[in-house]
């Protein structure tokens, strides 16, 4: 049973100040912690109430984290990432891709490199146009009688 | 719907050996950091030892040498063996479990974690 999630993909720059107990967040993955297929990218797995993450409110559970203070965090080891958000310092720079979910299919949750996800424009442009055709042939219809 | 169950506490003479077991169920350990804690009467609890999600083992110092940490995901269960144990080890220990690792503290912090178990009593004696 082949299911399909399509996903609407952001990207935003989220500077967090850390907070007494932190940045107040957990984090997957990496090259020896694969945590979506065919992706060793580093994604939010927890954020924690109260933490500085949780209070400024636009980190999500399930983001990936892409940078944090402008490096990249592309085929690194999970604890060289983890040491890397610890040693980042008071101000932390986040470069962050939302992932919304906008269709479900019966299996749960996939990988970037997975080919068989559409994006999301692919199918509303041409529903939009479809419609817009069908509206133009009903009016000239009308018209008609 | 996430639990821990502890088991395998006990009465032990002081310098006997003991394994207590944290066994998992509703989420997948692979990807979780799993800590052991413990409270002895009129304390506060304290980490013990933890094992984070690619499988580092971290020990607090009146515990290195005597303790093991050790995660079996196939079988989603976490054990503690505890060698030349003493009348202080006496106490409740409990397992805790947090998805992924934190990026603030190493696992042995016991507020990075969400879920916990219901204990198991060690008794040095």
């Known amino acids: 049973m082949n299911g399909r999630v399509d996903y609407l993909v952001t990207e935003e720059e989220i500077n967090l100040t850390r907070g007494p107990s932190g940045l107040g967040f957990n984090i997957v993955g990496g090259t020896d912690q694969q945590y979506v297929s065919n992706d060793s990218g580093i994604y939010v797995s927890r954020i924690k109430e109260n933490g500085a993450a949780a209070l400024d409110g636009r980190l999500q559970e399930g983001d990936k984290i892409l940078s944090v203070n402008g490096q990249d965090l592309k085929n690194l080891l999970h604890q060289d990432a983890v040491d890397l958000f610890r040693n980042a310092g008071y101000a932390v720079s986040l470069r962050v891709q939302h992932r919304l979910q906008v269709q479900n299919g019966p299996i749960g949750h996939r990988g970037e490199g997975d080919p068989s996800g559409i994006p999301i424009f692919m199918v509303l442009v041409p529903v939009f146009a479809l419609t817009m055709v069908a509206a133009w042939a009903f009016m000239r219809y009308r018209q008609q009688l | 719907d996430v639990q821990l169950v502890e088991s395998g506490g006990g009465l032990v003479q002081p310098g006997g050996s003991v394994r207590v077991s944290c066994v998992s169920s509703g989420f997948i350990l692979d990807y979780y950091a799993i800590g052991w804690f413990r409270q002895a009467p009129g304390k506060e609890r304290e980490g013990v030892s933890c094992i984070d999600s690619v499988g580092r083992a971290y020990y607090v110092d009146s515990v290195k040498g005597r303790f093991i940490i050790s995660r079996d995901n196939a079988k989603n269960t976490v054990y503690l063996q505890m060698n030349s144990l003493k009348p202080e080890d006496t106490a409740v220990y409990y397992c805790?479990?947090?998805?992924?690792?934190?990026?603030?503290?190493?696992?042995?912090?016991?507020?990075?974690?969400?879920?916990w178990g219901q204990g198991t009593q060690v008794t040095v004696s």
């Open positions: 805790a479990a947090d998805f992924g690792s934190s990026v603030d503290s190493t696992c042995l912090n016991n507020q990075q974690y969400d879920y």
